[in-house]
Amino acid sequence: ESGYAQNGDLEDAELDDYSFSCYSQLEVNGSQHSLTCAFEDPDVNITNLEFEICGALVEVKCLNFRKLQEIYFIETKKFLLIGKSNICVKVGEKSLTCKKIDLTTIVKPEAPFDLSVVYREGANDFVVTFNTSHLQKKYVKVLMHDVAYRQEKDENKWTHVNLSSTKLTLLQRKLQPAAMYEIKVRSIPDHYFKGFWSEWSPSYYFRTPEINNSSGEMDPI
């Protein structure tokens, strides 16, 4: 007979699906790393549920997560970043479900920032530049970036360009004249580390010049 038979809450809990997903962010706060997890079912009752990570840690055997609303997270310098850690959902001392995960394979980079677009009249093009905090990091330095742009009126018609640098040139003739464009960028690990796309950068908005009727070229803005 189960030692938990008297506990109605736990009996119900054992019928639930405790599947969860996580991502890591390395050197997200100085030399501190973070690990963020959430249940895949947003409706799981998380009242008494905790997350714990054990293994592939420096100086300690296990660490407990902090809870914020429906997410669980750790910020620490103690990730070894070699080998797999065991991440468990727990009620008290009882583990409900566990996953063995190598934190270097679930990396989510920080979002790029300082996105801007400059029109070059003589070259008839737009130079897109942005920044990423990963240029200064020790671990996740090499990223692939996804620049997406669209005419503002075309809700879901995004054009995507993948690049490894933080500079892109868009030819004026490939864009509609006298139109408002939205552009944004995100990043994903591209060397040794594996994982997920970052959040999108804040969008940048720019207007393309009018067409100069006499020459068929666009007027500068």
Epitope: N29, A38, L68, Q69, E70, I71, A111, E199, W200
Partner: nanobody, 121 residues
């Protein structure tokens, strides 16, 4: 569909202050990034301030030291305290809440309708 509602706009003299608020009509995933944008007369929409779930903030150069963004994750709200307002701050201010996807949550990108801020003597 989640609705974002901005409030707190109005008219103020140069040097004055306003506090904008953005409230959601539904539950927003706590990891979402919250952003204020603005669009001045005859201008393109521009970033004003960003706050991540961790509370990390970023500001446009033009508002640094004058504007402060904050959020309350428990209430799914975001505020923008605007001090030392200048005529060039005149614009419609929009709040935006964005999640790029992952952790089994679908991506979303919600916008408010905007609130007018006018700075004039």
């Amino acid at each position: 569909q989640v609705q974002l509602v901005e409030s707190g706009g109005g008219s103020v003299q140069p040097g004055g202050s306003l506090r904008l608020s953005c409230a959601t009509s539904g539950s927003i995933f706590s990891l979402a990034t919250m952003t204020w944008y603005r669009q001045g007369p005859g201008k393109t929409r521009e970033l004003v301030a960003v706050i991540t779930w961790r509370g990390t903030t970023t500001y446009a150069d033009s508002v640094k030291g004058r504007f402060t963004i904050s959020r309350d994750n428990a209430k799914n709200t975001m505020d923008l305290q605007m001090n030392g307002l200048k005529p060039e701050d005149t614009a419609v201010y929009y709040c935006n809440v964005k999640w790029g996807g992952g952790l089994n949550r679908e991506p979303f990108d919600y916008w408010g309708q905007g609130t007018q801020v006018t700075v004039s003597s």
